[in-house]
Structure formats: structure tokens, C-alpha cells
């Protein structure tokens, strides 16, 4: 099932997505689109990452994250209920079927009073998945030292551990690492 | 330490081609993008491409396409820029320039520059 | 194309003085700008890389901030080794484009 994320009408919500480049100038191509991922690609494209740069991008989507560290966290700018659904992160790692795909659930609730317009981006409180591709190269993974490797099985559990608490964004700020595989 | 070395000035005429020489030193070449930027006199700066050594791959801005090709010779650790269909608003001072991984693909490292200048 | 738009053009400042320059991008660039000083005859010279990252070698007198749409170099006291031109350049999507470039220099 999806981890979800929570804004209200108005603010910016941020879709966490991370991988660790395996060499430095060589960054994996990242894919975000709004719906479930689909078997290839994503479907309904709001941005796309290349080995460089941010090379497609839709009006209100932006990576305000250290993209070419590997942090492709979406931020959705000022809200609508409208932006409500699945959001896919999908890393394309070279070869056949490697890609790391990251369904993520966007739930945008009514704002309680009518906001002054902020770019505090609401996070939910679910643990943001990293994953660090095996690769040759000085790649930078900052890993918190309290925190085992853990696998996907147990990234769920964790995050819905986690939900609704503030760990998960001082985890984050951290530059806590999951690896994957 | 790190050094970018350029080719001298060119002299052309309206509609040939230039085409400028950049050697790395001091670092692993294929390791870094080298960027082409250019400054026509008296004015402010402008992005041609890049290209990555170690791939070749390369992304050029899209005002220039078709009239630049950029390439690299590892065995020389040597860039080159070369730009073709020359026309009098080419005159300027091309740059290459070394995008730096860790300072985020902005450029640590410049040649000196190589002026062109494109006259009939 | 991104474009970055600086402002002043042109500023005078008095030695010792504090120097501010902006920058402002026509779409949000996260934290992907770097700042330049460029003096007459030479290449520029990379200051500020990830918006607020000082390079190596840099004076701590200059810094930068921001974040998504506008940008800020500060130079706290000014001196006279800092009249140049000072460039903003985003690097979040190719065209990388420059600000038109602030001159700098002593009222």
C-alpha cells in the first residue's frame, strides 16, 4: 500500500523521493508522474530528471531538494484539492526492469481558516525511502549512525510507525539512509 | 592544480567555423563536465552546451543547435567547441569551463578564454 | 528558458560599506544558483555555488541566500579588491542562463 502524505488547500506538500548516485556526473534519469506507476515510464508526467539537470517540468512541480545529491523530492506549490491521488517517483536504473518505483498518496485537506500564503512545505510525517545504488565512484551517502540497513519489507512498517510524528523530519533533516537491495 | 588551457584567438569570416581548444590538467578529466560559455564585448553571459567526458554525452542550449558540436579526446584530456555558420554577433570571448559534482555543476575551474571575431 | 533578472545594474558603494545584490528567477530553481565575480580582462571566478555555499579560498565577507525564486550576495564591508562584475546563474535546467550583471563599485 502507498505511504501517505498530508497538506491543506493552499500549501506546498512535498513528496519525498531519494537515491545516492553511483558516481558522481553520472545521475540516474527520475521520473515523476501524478497516478500509480504504471510497468514503464510514468504515466501523466509532471517533471523528469536526466543525467544532469531538470529537463521536463509542469507548472507548480519543482525538486527544491539537492536533486544532484539524489534527493528528487516533489514539491507541489499551493495546493488544490485537485492534487489529491498517487503520486509515482520512479528511479530509471539502467537495464531491464531495475527501476525503483515509489507509489506515494497525496491527501489534501480543506484549510481550517483562510492561510496567508506560505512556502512552508507541510510535511507528513511518513519515512522518506532512499535508495542507494551499488555503484562505483565516490558516491555520498550520509548515513545516520543509530539506524540499521533496512529492507523493503520493513520500510511500511516503519513509515506507518512513523506517520503523524515529527521523528520522521528529524530523520530526514538528518540525511537518514534506507538501502534497498 | 587545476588548469584549463584555451587555443588562440580566431579571425573569421561570416559563415565558416571556429573551433576553440580547452586541455585540462590537474584532475581526472572524465571525471567533470566541461561547459562552453561565451561573452560578446561589452556584454553579459551566455551557455552554449556541455558535454560529459566520460560518455560523451552532451546537451547544448537549444539556441545554438545544429551550429555547435562539442567534443572531447581523453588521450589528450582536450575539449573542444566548435561552431559553425559564423555571423557577425558570434564575435565574443568563449569560455570552457569546468562543472564541479560537488559544487553542484556550477563552474569551479575557467580557461582563459578565447576571443573570436567574426568579420568580413 | 529560466530567466534570471538582477538588480541594480549598477551599484555604488562606499569601502567598508555593505554591498547587496539580487537576483530573481522567473521560475523557482530550488537552491540551484551560483554567484560569479568577474573583473575586466579575466574569466569570472565561481563564489557562491548552491545559493549559499561559499567556495574555496572565497572571502567569509561574501554570502549568499535564498531559495526558489529569489536570490541575495551579500559582501559585508567593501573593499577595494571587490569592484567587478557580479553574475547570478541558475543551474536547475539547461539553457543554464546568467543574470545581466551587476557592476559594482566604489561611491
Known amino acids: 500500500s502507498e505511504v501517505e502524505y498530508r497538506a491543506e488547500v493552499g500549501q506546498n506538500a512535498y513528496l519525498p523521493c531519494f537515491y545516492t548516485p553511483a558516481a558522481p556526473g553520472n545521475l540516474v534519469p527520475v521520473c515523476w508522474g501524478k497516478g500509480a506507476c504504471p510497468v514503464f515510464e510514468c504515466g501523466n508526467v509532471v517533471l523528469r530528471t536526466d543525467e544532469r539537470d531538470v529537463n521536463y517540468w509542469t507548472s507548480r512541480y519543482w525538486l527544491n531538494g539537492d536533486f544532484r545529491k539524489g534527493d528528487v523530492s516533489l514539491t507541489i506549490e499551493n495546493v488544490t484539492l485537485a492534487d489529491s491521488g498517487i503520486y509515482c517517483c520512479r528511479i530509471q536504473i539502467p537495464g531491464i526492469m531495475n527501476d525503483e518505483k515509489f507509489n506515494l498518496k497525496l491527501v489534501i485537506k480543506p484549510a481550517k481558516v483562510t492561510p496567508a500564503p506560505t512556502r512552508q512545505r507541510d510535511f507528513t510525517a511518513a519515512f522518506p525511502r532512499m535508495l542507494t545504488t551499488r555503484g562505483h565512484g565516490p558516491a555520498e551517502t550520509q548515513t545516520l549512525g543509530s539506524l540499521p540497513d533496512i529492507n523493503l519489507t520493513q520500510i511500511s512498517t516503519l513509515a506507518n510507525e512513523l506517520r503523524d510524528s515529527r521523528l520522521a523530519n528529524d530523520l530526514r533533516d538528518s540525511g537518514a539512509t534506507i538501502r534497498i537491495g | 592544480q587545476v588548469q584549463l588551457v584555451q587555443s588562440g584567438a580566431e579571425v573569421k569570416k561570416p559563415g565558416a567555423s571556429v573551433k576553440v581548444s580547452c586541455k585540462a590538467s590537474?584532475?581526472?578529466?572524465?571525471?567533470?563536465?566541461m561547459d562552453w560559455v561565451r561573452q560578446a564585448p561589452g556584454q553579459g553571459l551566455e551557455w552554449l552546451g556541455y558535454?560529459?567526458?566520460?560518455?560523451?554525452?552532451?546537451s547544448y542550449n537549444q539556441k545554438f543547435k545544429g551550429r555547435v558540436t562539442m567534443t572531447t579526446d581523453k588521450s589528450t584530456s582536450t575539449a573542444y567547441m566548435e561552431l559553425r555558420s559564423l555571423r557577425s554577433d558570434d564575435t565574443a570571448v568563449y569560455y570552457c569551463?569546468?562543472?564541479?559534482?560537488?559544487?553542484?555543476?556550477?563552474?569551479?575551474?575557467w580557461g582563459q578564454g578565447t576571443t573570436v571575431t567574426v568579420s568580413s | 528558458d529560466i530567466v534570471m533578472t538582477q538588480s541594480p545594474d549598477s551599484l555604488p558603494v562606499s569601502l567598508g560599506e555593505r554591498a547587496t545584490i539580487n537576483c530573481k528567477a522567473s521560475?523557482?530553481?530550488?537552491?540551484?544558483v551560483a554567484w560569479y565575480q568577474q573583473k575586466p580582462g579575466q574569466p569570472p571566478k565561481l563564489l557562491i555555488y548552491?545559493?549559499?555555499n561559499r567556495y574555496t579560498g572565497v572571502p567569509d565577507r561574501f554570502s549568499g541566500s535564498g531559495s526558489g525564486t529569489d536570490f541575495t550576495l551579500t559582501i559585508s564591508s567593501l573593499q577595494a579588491e571587490d569592484v567587478a562584475v557580479y553574475y547570478c546563474q541558475q543551474h536547475y535546467s539547461s539553457p543554464y542562463t546568467f543574470g545581466q550583471g551587476t557592476k559594482l563599485e566604489i561611491k
Open positions: 569551463a569546468r562543472g564541479g559534482y560537488y559544487s553542484y555543476y556550477s563552474y569551479d575551474y
Open positions: 558535454i560529459y567526458p566520460n560518455n560523451g554525452g552532451t
Open positions: 521560475q523557482s530553481v530550488g537552491n540551484n
Open positions: 548552491y545559493a549559499s
Open positions: 590537474g584532475y581526472t578529466f572524465t571525471d567533470y563536465y
